[in-house]
């Protein structure tokens, strides 16, 4: 089990169902890091689709939260067919205070 103590947490969210079913819409997988401390100046995101790294994600400016920590969001645009076919999306979060990078994986429920 992870020994993580007081560090950031990572949540990975699927695209909205409507976005995956309508070709006119843009489905996105969203990686959210919360409880980022003021002493952690940067958070690095790496994204993988079926184990292959991709570089088209967009990281939004960090937002200060009410509890004096930051929230950082990275968004990966996915291909409709890739999501519907069950491809696996992994978000890896790292910085020089995270000795064990945090990884979260998501795919369309079978």
């Amino acid at each position: 089990a992870p020994e993580l103590l007081g560090g950031p947490s990572v949540f990975l969210f699927p695209p909205k169902p409507k976005d995956t079913l309508m070709i006119s819409r843009t489905p996105e997988v969203t990686c959210v890091v919360v409880d980022v401390s003021h002493e952690d100046p940067e958070v690095k995101f790496n994204w993988y689709v079926d184990g292959v790294e991709v570089h088209n994600a967009k990281t939004k400016p960090r937002e200060e939260q009410y509890n004096s920590t930051y929230r950082v969001v990275s968004v990966l645009t996915v291909l409709h067919q890739d999501w519907l076919n069950g491809k696996e999306y992994k978000c890896k979060v790292s910085n020089k205070a995270l000795g064990a990078p945090i990884e979260k994986t998501i795919s369309k429920a079978k």
């Epitope: 103590l5 560090g7 401390s37 002493e39 952690d40 000795g99 064990a100 990078p101």
Partner: antibody, heavy 119, light 109 residues
């Protein structure tokens, strides 16, 4: 309990090579960055380099780049340091060190292995 | 390569407070340097105390705290104990490598 055990040190002639190993136990080795740090006799610490859990990134001390190579085998829970073109100034105790999940980058240390470069 | 400078030696009385500092030759130390503090006890026993400027490692007593102070990284020991007598090293991160300071020999006397 985290345990790191270095081996492979010894006496080597200038210009020679040596491969050090660090056997890890008591934690999920494949999740963590790992470091090599050295300490020359009677001197302070010098960082040698580090490697990501998946070996995708390896960083070295600028002064050592090119002569030293860090690698790992997650299946064997082992970290390695290949040292080539050794010089007298490489004489030191070499330690592997593991970060904590969050915070301390040099949290857990091995007992070290002594490398002596001399003719 | 950057040079990281520490006080060569400091003395503190038992129960007293002392601050060890870590200066960078490249300018002010910031959170981007992810300051770490390592304790060396006799027989080359090393323990990481603090990382990421101010995050205590598990097992690090609460009397140790990390901070940035006047452009330097600082390790403050409040309520020194005899067992805190040791060598203390700081390490700073510079984009793609770490640099250790020369160490501070702390005497509890």
């Amino acid at each position: 309990e985290v345990q790191l055990v270095e081996s492979g040190g010894g006496l080597v002639q200038p210009g020679g090579s040596l491969r050090l190993s660090c056997a890890a136990s008591g934690f999920t080795f494949s999740r963590y960055w790992m470091n090599w740090v050295r300490q020359a006799p009677g001197k302070g610490l010098e960082w040698v380099g580090e490697i990501t859990p998946d070996s995708s990134t390896i960083n070295y001390a600028p002064s050592l780049k090119g002569r030293f190579t860090i690698s790992r085998d997650n299946a064997k829970n082992s970290l390695y340091l290949q040292m080539n073109s050794l010089r007298a100034e490489d004489t030191a105790v070499y330690y592997c060190a593991r970060p904590y999940d969050y915070g301390a980058w040099f949290a857990s240390w091995g007992q070290g292995t002594l490398v002596t470069v001399s003719s | 390569q950057a040079v990281v400078t520490q006080e060569p030696s400091l003395t503190v009385s038992p129960g007293g407070t002392v601050t060890l500092t870590c200066r960078s030759s490249t300018g002010a130390v910031t959170t981007s340097n992810y300051a770490n503090w390592v304790q060396e006890k006799p027989d080359h026993l090393f323990t990481g105390l603090i990382g990421g400027t101010n995050k205590r490692a598990p097992g690090t007593p609460a009397r140790f705290s990390g901070s940035l102070l006047g452009g330097k990284a600082a390790l403050t020991l409040s309520g020194a104990q005899p067992e805190d007598e040791a060598e203390y090293y700081c390490a700073l991160w510079y984009s793609n490598h770490w640099v250790f300071g020369g160490g501070t020999k702390l005497t509890v006397l």
